[in-house]
């Protein structure tokens, strides 16, 4: 069937970057400016995406591929192909309907995007809080209270440093 179709349909010979022009006896015409066709045999070219406002051009449109956008500084991409730009907040904040708001007590956000998340509950793992949480940082859990016998150090000494990729002697 494919072979038959290509014999009958001159449009199948039109390469990417062109379209099959019905107004000109199905001649393969180049895509007009600001349009593209990414596959062969197209009867029309698609309009190039325009990166406007907070969207900036990451890759220019060509006759065979669409433009690609990202976001200007202070914003980050959301959605497939950067279909949205969302304003950054500071660490320790989240974007709400009323703008960037500080994380509530007991929550943190260590990024400029996303939502505030609850601090880790160390006691669920039978551990104690070694370092308190902040708006920007999660708590650090330490050994369980039972491990902290009098005189015992509450912090495990670090392992001796070694070069990456080397096994311990």
């Amino acid at each position: 069937f494919e072979r038959t179709r290509s014999l009958q349909d001159p449009c199948s010979n039109c390469p990417a970057g062109t379209f099959c022009d019905n107004n000109r006896n199905q001649i393969c015409s180049p895509c007009p400016p600001n349009s593209f066709s990414s596959a062969g045999g197209q009867r029309t070219c698609d309009i190039c995406r325009q990166c406007k406002g907070v969207f900036r051009t990451r890759k220019e449109c060509s006759s065979t591929s669409n433009a690609e956008c990202d976001c200007t500084p202070g914003f980050h991409c959301l959605g497939a192909g950067c279909s949205m730009c969302e304003q950054d907040c500071k660490q320790g904040q989240e974007l709400t309907k009323k703008g960037c708001k500080d994380c509530c007590f007991g929550t943190f956000n260590d990024q400029k995007r996303g939502i505030c998340r609850p601090w880790t509950n160390c006691s669920l793992d039978g551990k104690s809080v070694l370092v308190n949480g902040t708006k920007e940082r999660d708590v650090v859990c330490g050994p369980s209270p039972a491990d902290l016998s009098p005189g015992a150090s509450s912090v495990t000494p670090p392992a001796p440093a070694r070069e990456p990729g080397h096994s311990p002697q």
Partner: nanobody, 122 residues
């Protein structure tokens, strides 16, 4: 064809006022949410304010109680009344459609005006 044309920018002294207008055409304005953004010289964009089709308004913290967004659906125009202007309000102000209805978020299908420059200086 969608068009957004801003006007009303200019030079104003600190503490002064300006009213920006954005005339819209080429789409159903009355059912569209609209927004204002700004870009200070050498800096990134900042979401300033937004207004839903029903009239609910939203502002970024730094302009709250100083700026007022409003709309006139009969004139297909959205306004930004700016009072108590500060030097840090100096920027190019852009009008844009606001299809996401989410604070600080614009989508690729939103339309943008060319901007109007507001300079706050003595």
């Amino acid at each position: 064809e969608v068009q957004l044309v801003e006007s009303g920018g200019g030079l104003v002294q600190p503490g002064g006022s300006l009213r920006l207008s954005c005339a819209a055409s080429g789409f159903t304005f009355s059912s569209s949410a609209m927004s204002w953004a700004r870009q200070a010289p050498g800096k990134g964009f900042e979401w300033v304010s937004g207004i839903y089709s029903g009239g609910s308004t939203y502002y970024t913290e730094s302009v709250k109680d100083r700026f007022t967004i409003s709309r006139d659906n009969a004139k297909n125009t959205v306004y930004l009344q700016m009072n108590s202007l500060k030097p840090e309000d100096t920027a190019v102000y852009y009008c844009a459609t606001w299809g996401t209805l989410r604070f600080g978020v614009w989508a690729e299908y939103d339309h943008w005006g060319q901007g109007t420059l507001v300079t706050v200086s003595s």
